[in-house]
């Protein structure tokens, strides 16, 4: 039985230009994360393998840093980059977890840098 | 046309090293990671290490931990691998690989080296 | 280390025949699976990566299924220059590793 949950950023903004930091956590299970892929709507940005280490997309990988932790640094944002994110979780014995961010880039300086909302993001599939 | 284009043929005693090269060109050397891998005469393939030409950050199959070292040079677009402590079993065609777009396989394979270890 | 099997070892078949290798792995890898065709003194080629995914330029009877432990690579109707050796690779964990191959020759 999964038990996880996902804990995201939930919807964030940030300025065209700058940097954002994507951030998923798993909590509630004791299941054994084995890779993390990060995922802009079907298009691969990086993984994060717990034996092989990172590999970033070469599409993103001058704008795209690993970390910190599980999570992913994207820079030199562009209003292209607005749209949807996900972390998805490969664990075991659990199977996937999949945790989803809105990102909005504004072209204005009043972005506001953080979350949101208050309440994380919870989804999980197998 | 991505191109890797490895040094030539190796005969080495026991106990010695050889150190292998990879020359890239065709796309940009720091974007995709570089692995290598061994098959021996007659044999499988054999994953050995892969390495980020970028940031330098290798990782390792651990049974050739010790005596492997994966290095790139990024004003060349070359990669090598330096085996150590040679011996008989070492015997192998080696192949660097370059990493795909999404994920750990191998896209593109040098036309491998041979390497003889005997005394 | 994550085990790979691949059967069978060998086979024989005519051009026009539909050719089926399987591949099984000793833990759950998902869909991280690639397979690689070889012939004698060249370097391995990629087929199929992520399972199913045909890599640039591989010939549409080629095709990848499966997930978790088991695998196939379905060659419609084989040709002439498909006479080979077949390796699956899973790109999941470290070590990476092969499976020992299938050799495929002429009938």
């Known amino acids: 039985m999964m038990t996880g949950t996902i804990e995201t950023t939930g919807n964030i903004s940030a300025e065209k230009g700058g940097s954002i930091i994507l951030q998923c956590h798993l909590s509630s299970t004791t299941a054994q994360v084995t890779q993390v892929n990060w995922e802009q709507q079907d298009q691969l940005l990086a993984i994060c393998n717990a034996d092989l280490g990172w590999h970033i997309s070469p599409s993103f990988k001058d704008r795209v840093a690993p970390g910190p932790g599980l999570g992913l640094t994207l820079q030199s944002l562009t209003v292209n980059d607005t749209g949807e994110y996900f972390c998805i979780y490969h664990t075991y014995p659990d199977g996937t977890y999949t945790g989803r961010i809105f990102l909005e880039v504004l072209e204005s300086s009043v972005a506001e840098h953080g979350a949101r909302f208050q309440i994380p993001h919870h989804h999980h599939h197998h | 046309e991505v191109q890797l284009v490895q040094s030539g043929a190796e005969v080495k005693k026991p106990g010695a090293s050889v150190k292998v090269s990879c020359k890239a060109s065709g796309y940009t050397f720091t974007n995709y990671y570089m692995h290598w891998v061994r098959q021996a005469p007659g044999q499988g393939l054999e994953w050995m290490g892969r390495i980020d030409p970028d940031s330098g950050g290798s990782k390792y199959n651990e049974k050739f931990k010790s005596r492997v070292t994966i290095t790139v040079d990024k004003l060349s677009s070359t990669a090598y691998m330096e085996l150590s402590s040679l011996r008989s079993e070492d015997t192998a065609v080696y192949y660097c690989?370059?990493?795909?777009?999404?994920?750990?396989?191998?896209?593109?394979w040098g036309q491998g080296t041979t390497v003889t270890v005997s005394s | 280390d994550i085990q790979m099997t691949q059967s069978p070892s060998s086979l024989s078949a005519s051009v026009g025949d539909r050719v089926t290798i399987t591949c099984r792995v000793s833990?759950?890898?998902?869909?991280?699976l690639a397979w690689y065709q070889q012939k004698p003194g060249k370097s391995p080629k990629l087929l199929v990566y992520n399972a199913k995914t045909l890599a640039e330029g591989v010939p549409s009877r080629f095709s990848g299924s499966g997930s978790g432990t088991d695998f196939t690579l379905t060659i419609s109707s084989l040709q002439p220059e498909d006479f080979a050796t077949y390796y699956c690779q899973h790109h999941y964990g470290n070590p990476l590793t092969f499976g020992p191959g299938t050799k495929v020759d002429i009938k």
């Open positions: 690989a370059r990493e795909g777009h999404y994920g750990f396989y191998s896209d593109y």
């Open positions: 833990e759950n890898i998902y869909s991280y």
